[in-house]
Amino acid sequence: EVEKTACPSGKKAREIDESLIFYKKWELEACVDAALLATQMDRVNAIPFTYEQLDVLKHKLDELYPQGYPESVIQHLGYLFLKMSPEDIRKWNVTSLETLKALLEVNKGHEMSPQVATLIDRFVKGRGQLDKDTLDTLTAFYPGYLCSLSPEELSSVPPSSIWAVRPQDLDTCDPRQLDVLYPKARLAFQNMNGSEYFVKIQSFLGGAPTEDLKALSQQNVSMDLATFMKLRTDAVLPLTVAEVQKLLGPHVEGLKAEERHRPVRDWILRQRQDDLDTLGLGLQGGIPNGYLVLDLSMQEALS
């Protein structure tokens, strides 16, 4: 907290400009009018104020707007946004997408901070819905934001947003989310050639159905085991030994190390032991020779 001291003669700020960087903290407190600051907030961003000086400017705005800043001020906070706490942000009513973009721009290239998470939450609540434009904006700045959304919210994500997604951004997505994202990714990347397509679609394959995995097995993609282990168990089970061998290519040898883990374990249980033996990996647990395989789920469907 800066002491209340009188502004020295001739130092009263008539406008927010670069000369203020030479003011000591107590001079900023004494000589800058909060109302002037509020009306000229857009200038602050271009001025290299120190972290400590920004503290004083924030304090002045807090005194002027104890109930929370108006959107006209919020939109022009610039780097002063970095000084805001989630508690400050919860007092705001942010409804303009331009305001959201302006503040996300300040944090661009950095991890999503608690301030940004709170801002997004306030914005979405203020709008009452997560519309396409909002999602477009959020996924452009934070592709990882996708995994924090429910499958219902994800359904309105435009396929064009998928292009910004990096593999690590999907690390926290669960299968239900990937089920929604995969068809969008398939649509987004549909015009790419085989190998390029696989590179892009690989991160989304946790949502792929059996028929798409079968199609990929015909394209010499050489899927790595880490990707294979993230596939939906129900999508992997119908694959034949030959199809899995083609899908994994040289990585097929990795199945041995994963034979006790899903989906490999469950897949092994569905294969004929004779077929598994053709891989030469010593995989055990397949259906013994001469046994008849009844698909009970199919039988129930017919009756």
Epitope: E18, N45, I47, P48, F49, T50, Y79, L82
Partner: nanobody, 117 residues
Framework: QVQPVESGGGLVQPGGSLRLSCVVS????????MAWYRQASGKERESVAF????????LYLDSVRGRFTISRDIDKKTVYLQMDNLKPEDTGVYYC??????????WGQGTQVTVSS
């Protein structure tokens, strides 16, 4: 965010000169105004010189005006501070920064300037 790298400090007698350099690699140097700051032991960090992004607007702290000269070389991504007629009260660690860096409290190591006989 790449931190600035300052150099050129040293021990100098009163009335002497030094030229400080600050290299800001990896950022969009042309986008930001830059400033030189200094911090004396136990004192608040203060701004001593400012140069706008186009290099046309230059401002100084009252106590250094006429003795210090700030300039920038866009091609070399470098900001300079020519310090002449140095005084003991100019002693401190000198830093340079841009608005984004200063706002995020990202600072380089600084360069020590000591003015003493």
């Amino acid at each position: 965010q790449v931190q600035p790298v300052e150099s050129g400090g040293g021990l100098v007698q009163p009335g002497g000169s030094l030229r400080l350099s600050c290299v800001v690699s990896g950022s969009d140097f042309t986008e930001d105004a830059m400033a030189w700051y200094r911090q004396a032991s136990g004192k608040e960090r203060e701004s001593v010189a400012f140069v706008s992004k186009d290099g046309k607007r230059i401002l100084y702290l009252d106590s250094v005006r006429g003795r210090f000269t700030i300039s920038r070389d866009i091609d070399k991504k470098t900001v300079y501070l020519q310090m002449d007629n140095l005084k003991p009260e100019d002693t401190g660690v000198y830093y340079c920064n841009s608005a984004p860096g200063a706002a995020r409290n990202y600072w380089g190591q600084g360069t020590q300037v000591t003015v003493s006989s």
